[in-house]
């Protein structure tokens, strides 16, 4: 029978910007029954707060309401893991909101082929960004990456499609079936999880030849 | 404890590349950006680039673009900056650093000495 | 790019007397968010640079209250209360604001 070993923050997630979840990985547990306790404090305090909601986020986790979320400062924090015979910390973590948003996926996804007398066919592709997404404030830059494959095909083919809610696709199989998804990310943020797939079915007369 | 291992020094000809690694320890690998940052002799520091090993999402400075490349390797918990078309001007410490969740640098690697030279 | 300007160039102060150092930015530092990403690193002799202060005034971790950080706006300062031996070094503004990051020319602190 051990004091518990190191915990470790490992993860920071915010929608949004208005609320966000830490999760912790314990240490070994020596043992025996192990209690977790995060602890915090923000920029230019010293009074140290304990996790307001240890529930939300599942195990391992704090949750910090929109109540308990500033963009204006950052995080201190720490994991304390403790049993009979002692304790450990984790070492200290510092979050910054902005730099830990993972959006909800794109909304909206609609493809089209469009065949223009004149020019090549191409498949156009647009999508809305998530709701919970202010992009109005200005210091919210998402991008965009699309892919889509043939229904019946292992590999997908990916486009990077910067800031645009739109994109247009030259180079595709006639007379196959294609899904096709969107996901964006803030600049310094992660990527958001794929939108529900949208299938299209190309025309056998889709020509790819100039 | 949070540890950042770089490559040994390194000589090279003018038009050639190079290739440093960066190994982390004593945290998850995936979980927080890594930079380069580079220090010619008696100079000032200079921000090459930056990537997040989760899914090496990159950000370069435009100086180096085309001229860097910075990856990871989650299976060995290393990154690597690769600058191309070596001149003499290039000759410089070269550091890695790590960020928290925040867009400023807490741990250094030790640096690695290039020196571009024919 | 945003240019950072130090000065001064280098500093030679007595133990136990008090240093500042100024930086000055191109253009406001102020994020659309509202932060200012503007930090201070010390790079010892022969050593990597390290974190003194983020976010213009916050000490990192283990950094003595010697140190601190003020400023707003383009202009910024970093005071030593009082100058100890082990201060020695090069001391760099940073901001990183605006992509990509940038550094100040650096001020070389020395002990008289």
């Known amino acids: 029978q051990l004091p518990p070993g190191k915990p470790e923050i490992f993860k920071c997630r915010s929608p949004n910007k208005e609320t966000f979840t830490c999760w912790w990985r314990p240490g070994t547990d020596g043992g025996l029954p192990t209690n977790y306790s995060l602890t915090y404090h923000r920029e230019g305090e010293t009074l140290m707060h304990e996790c307001p909601d240890y529930i939300t986020g599942g195990p391992n986790s704090c949750h910090f309401g929109k109540q308990y979320t500033s963009m204006w400062r950052t995080y201190i924090m720490m994991v304390n893991a403790t049993n009979q015979m002692g304790s450990s910390f984790s070492d200290e973590l510092y979050v910054d909101v902005t730099y830990i948003v993972q959006p909800d996926p794109p909304l909206e996804l609609a493809v089209e082929v469009k065949q223009p007398e004149d020019r090549k066919p191409y498949l156009w592709i647009k999508w809305s960004p998530p709701t919970l997404i202010d992009l109005k404030t200005g210091w919210f830059t998402l991008l965009y990456e699309i892919r889509l494959k043939p229904e019946k095909a292992a590999e997908w083919e990916i486009h990077f499609a910067g800031q645009q809610t739109e994109f247009k696709i030259l180079s595709l199989h006639p007379g196959q079936k294609y899904l096709v998804q969107v996901r964006c990310k803030p600049d310094h943020g992660y990527w958001s999880a794929w939108s529900p797939a949208t299938f299209i079915q190309i025309p056998s007369d889709f020509t790819m030849n100039d | 404890q949070v540890q950042l291992v770089q490559s040994g020094a390194e000589v090279k000809k003018p038009g050639s590349s190079v290739k440093v690694s960066c190994k982390a320890s004593?945290?998850?690998?995936?979980?927080?950006?890594i930079h380069w940052v580079r220090q010619a002799p008696g100079q000032g520091l200079e921000w090459m680039g930056e990537?997040?090993?989760?899914?090496?999402?990159?950000n370069y400075n435009q100086k180096f673009k085309g001229r860097v490349t910075i990856t990871a390797d989650k299976s060995t918990s290393t990154a690597y900056m690769e600058l191309s078309s070596l001149r003499s001007e290039d000759t410089a410490v070269y550091y890695c650093?790590?960020?928290?969740?925040?867009?400023?640098?807490?741990?250094w690697g030790q640096g690695t000495l290039v020196t571009v030279s024919s | 790019d945003i240019v950072m300007t130090q000065t001064p160039l280098s500093l030679s102060v007595t133990p136990g007397q008090p240093a500042s150092i100024s930086c000055r930015s191109s253009?406001?530092?102020?994020?659309?968010?509202?932060?200012?990403?503007l930090h201070w690193y010390l790079q010892k002799p022969g050593q990597s640079p390290q974190l003194l202060i983020y976010k213009v005034s916050n000490r990192f971790s283990g950094v003595p209250d010697r140190f601190s950080g003020s400023g707003s706006g383009t202009d910024f300062t970093l005071k030593i209360s009082r100058v100890e031996a082990e201060d020695v070094g090069v001391y760099y503004c940073s901001q990183s604001t605006h992509v990509p990051f940038t550094f100040g020319g650096g001020t070389k602190v020395e002990i008289k």
């Open positions: 990537i997040d090993p989760s899914d090496s999402y990159t």
């Open positions: 004593g945290y998850t690998f995936t979980s927080y950006w």
């Open positions: 253009q406001s530092l102020v994020h659309s968010n509202g932060n200012t990403y």
């Open positions: 650093a790590r960020s928290f969740f925040t867009n400023w640098f807490a741990y």
